[in-house]
């Protein structure tokens, strides 16, 4: 061993200076009578070594590194030997920080494992091997006087928690607990906790269960859930308060908290929820009124609230078959009376024969918004209800009466845009209670079964905007019927388009007769097309060889036209424009030549 390094300290604060000396023994001088000692930190040569020969013939080099900024590095003492660097000795240097004070020390008593689990935050990285020890002692009072020490608890490497087993614990008696951190640069201690293990007990949560429905118990109300919880048996004798949280399974709703609740609720009804909605529920508990920690939330229970009977108004309308007046087609529309009006599973139309107390005869049961049934000869009225699993809506009476009320007048309709029509009228006197407005395709596509209808509850209304099932270029029939207390007025109807189409083509022009200065033209009108407004007029255009244009407007019933004042032996271009309120279309161009002066007329 030729050389030996000694250092002021192998472990220092990061950034602190360090001094090292390297001594080469005399018996190594054969390498070089005046060897030059070099220093290397890691892979980098370090200048600044001060070398001297000592009295005993040994060579010494001393170096001071002003700042050790590496957390770990090897310092080497070397000699140049040939072309290579020969390492004589090396030492490991470490730099870091003394341990910070561990903080946020907290403990939980786990009754299942019978141990006190304490955890802490170790603080910033020291870059040095640092050991943590959980230290504790038993105390009769408030930890001012130290009783028996408890065996140190040393966590596994890298862990910031430790378990004190039951044999070292005394329940209902205070313990002093703290964490000590230690490394080569120093020792630190956390603030001391003084606690009774039972005051930091963390219980297991109860198990949530749904209530088994019993025959004598009333079913839960709409928007309510019946549930119960089974306390965690080992914690049964600990007074606790609990809280429940719930949220709908669908949507982004946050948890709603309910509490405090008793641990021992054998059954609990949770209300104020949305009807017919699936909910997720969880419960947790805490020792109370004595101190403790909240348990974790229990596993989720998923329950569905009962639905409420439909709360709707049913607007109704009916029609009799012309061939069989006892066959009635009844239509209805549910109008919600509340924000959550309940799910509708179906509808029932029924009739109660007079003299048969309690007897109700169903005429139809459907999920549709209409039904056709045969009205018994003595029946003047039926009842309509909406139903679901929770019950029925209030019955809506439907009275079948003659049209005895006054009619409305001046029914008219106009397009608002391609998808809506405004229908207006003058109300009769006296005011009706409301109106039924029906609309559907007019002839030739008319069909009673495909009509859309709406109830206007305001008897003073003078019009209604039709926005449903309106398409452009279709002819609609609109029927309005006034409704009175026990009867109705005669229905009125009007036809209208929301948007009409321009003619798709103008008739082809044909030359019938021609002369020197005239030409007789004719055409066959296009047959009327559904969705296209009727022609308002034709315009005929003709242009001579000099590009002079002439035109004449003809009425829509015209079938031909004679052009007069033409030049003999001249070329003309002629076309017909067919026009309606929705636009105009040109025919193809007819080109003709008038006869020469000496030629005879053509007929």
């Amino acid at each position: 061993e030729c050389g030996h390094i000694s250092v002021s300290a192998p472990i220092v604060h990061l950034g602190d200076p360090i001094t090292a000396s390297c001594i080469i023994k005399q018996n190594c001088s054969h390498l070089d009578p005046e060897p030059q000692i070099l220093w290397r930190l890691g892979a980098e040569l370090q200048p600044g070594g001060r070398q001297q020969r000592l009295s005993d013939g040994t060579q010494e080099s001393i170096i001071t590194l002003p700042h050790l900024n590496h957390t770990q590095a090897f310092l080497s003492c070397c000699l140049n030997w040939g072309n290579s660097l020969q390492i004589l000795d090396q030492v490991e240097l470490r730099a870091g920080y003394p341990p910070a004070i561990p903080h946020n020390l907290s403990c939980l008593m786990n009754l299942t494992t019978s141990s006190l689990i304490c955890q802490w935050e170790p603080g910033p990285e020291t870059h040095l091997p640092t050991s943590f020890t959980l230290k504790s002692f038993k105390s009769r009072g408030n930890c001012q006087t130290q009783g028996d020490s408890i065996l140190d608890c040393v966590p596994k490497d890298g862990q910031s928690h430790c378990c004190i087993p039951r044999k070292h614990l005394l329940l209902y008696q205070n313990m002093g607990i703290w964490v000590q951190a230690e490394n080569a640069l120093g020792t630190s201690m956390s603030p001391q906790l003084c606690l009774d293990p039972m005051d930091v007990v963390k219980l297991e949560p109860p198990m949530l269960r749904t209530m088994d429905p019993s025959p004598e118990a009333a079913p839960p109300q709409a928007g309510c859930l019946q549930l119960c919880w089974e306390p965690w048996q080992p914690g049964l004798h600990i007074n606790q308060k609990c809280e429940l949280r719930h949220k709908p399974q669908r949507g982004e709703a946050s948890w709603a908290l309910v509490g405090p609740l008793p641990l021992e609720a054998l059954q609990y009804e949770l209300c104020g929820l949305l009807p017919a909605t699936a909910y997720t529920l969880q419960i947790r508990c805490i020792r109370w009124p004595l101190p403790g920690h909240w348990s974790d939330w229990s596993p989720s229970l998923e329950l569905r609230t009962t639905e409420r009977a439909p709360t709707v108004r049913l607007d109704t309308w009916w029609r009799q078959r012309q061939l069989d007046p006892r066959t009635v087609q009844l239509f209805w529309k549910p109008v919600p009376l509340e924000e959550d009006s309940g799910r509708i599973q179906g509808y029932v139309v029924s009739w109660r024969p007079s003299g048969q107390a309690g007897a109700i005869l169903p005429l139809c049961n459907t999920t549709e918004l209409s039904c056709t049934f045969h009205l018994p000869s003595e029946a003047q009225e039926v009842a309509l209800v909406a139903y679901n699993s929770a019950g029925t809506s209030r019955p809506t009476p439907v009275v079948f009466s003659e049209s005895r009320g006054p009619a409305l007048t001046r029914l008219h309709a106009m397009a608002r845009d391609p998808h809506s029509l405004w229908v207006g009228w003058e109300p009769p006197n006296p005011w009706p209670q409301g109106y039924v407005i029906e609309w559907g395709l007019g002839p030739p596509s008319a069909s009673n079964s495909n009509k859309t209808w709406r109830m206007e509850q305001n008897g003073r209304a003078t019009g209604f905007l039709l926005k449903e099932n309106i398409r452009p270029f279709q002819l609609y029939e609109i029927i309005v019927t006034p409704l009175y207390q026990d009867t109705m007025g005669p229905s009125q109807h009007v036809y209208a388009y929301s948007q009409e189409m321009a003619p798709s083509h103008a008739p082809e022009l044909h030359l019938k007769h021609i002369g020197k200065t005239w030409a007789q033209l004719e055409w066959v009108p296009e047959p009327p097309e559904l969705g296209k407004s009727p022609l308002t007029h034709y315009t005929i255009f003709w242009t001579n060889a000099q590009n002079q244009s002439f035109s004449a407007i003809l009425n829509a019933s015209s079938r031909g036209f004679v052009l007069h004042g033409l030049e003999p032996a001249s070329l003309y271009h002629i076309h017909l424009m067919a026009a309606s309120q929705a636009g105009a279309t040109n025919s193809t161009v007819l080109t003709l030549m008038t006869l020469t002066p000496e030629g005879s007329e053509l007929h």
């Epitope: 009754l111 299942t112 494992t113 019978s114 039951r166 044999k167 329940l171 039972m198 306390p231 048996q233 080992p234 049964l236 004798h237 600990i238 007074n239 008793p262 641990l263 021992e264 609720a265 054998l266 020792r287 009124p289």
Partner: antibody
Framework: EVQLLESGGGLVQPGGSLRLSCAAS????????MGWVRQAPGKGLEWVSS????????PYADSVKGRFTISRDNSKNTLYLQMNSLRAEDTAVYYC???????????WGQGTLVTVSS | DIQMTQSPSSLSASVGDRVTITCRAS??????LNWYQQKPGKAPKLLIY???NLQNGVPSRFSGSGSGTDFTLTISSLQPEDFATYYC?????????FGGGTKVEIK
Amino acid sequence: EVQLLESGGGLVQPGGSLRLSCAASGFTFSLYWMGWVRQAPGKGLEWVSSISSSGGVTPYADSVKGRFTISRDNSKNTLYLQMNSLRAEDTAVYYCAKLGELGQFMRWGQGTLVTVSS
Amino acid sequence: DIQMTQSPSSLSASVGDRVTITCRASQGISSYLNWYQQKPGKAPKLLIYYASNLQNGVPSRFSGSGSGTDFTLTISSLQPEDFATYYCQQSIGYPGSFGGGTKVEIK
């Protein structure tokens, strides 16, 4: 000082009824579970029933289920055991006890003797 | 239901002896095991709760150990006032159950 004082024991014919009472003092009665434990002559201890601090939970031993009813009146600091359809095997000293948070019987009354015999 | 088995059912010992009584549960009960002492004609008295916690006022010669299914009550140096019957009891759940008892008599 915690005190539990049982009363209501005595001689009763098989099929008869008896109501035991336990007057508690020296602690906040409404915060603790209470219970009844019995000991037949010359035999070991047998748990009979317990009741939670508010009275909502009342477990029973199979041997007395359906015949005995435990109850409490927190305003009177009193625990009760209503015993119906008594049998000869119900003969025992009945102890009232205060329970701790870990289910231990922390304090016991002096006991009251119930004798079921014709 | 959880059964508690105590052994021995009786033992004879002298003052100053170290006495050990065991209690076995038919299934794991964590540390929910309590020990009671009863003297003839008297009510039972709690000695140890939660397997190893000494009840206030109980001499330190009494100690408890064990967890799960096997538990031990130890009297380190038997005193004249310790001659009595000792019972174990599980309190992890209902129905609550006691061991059959161990009678400690003077040798």
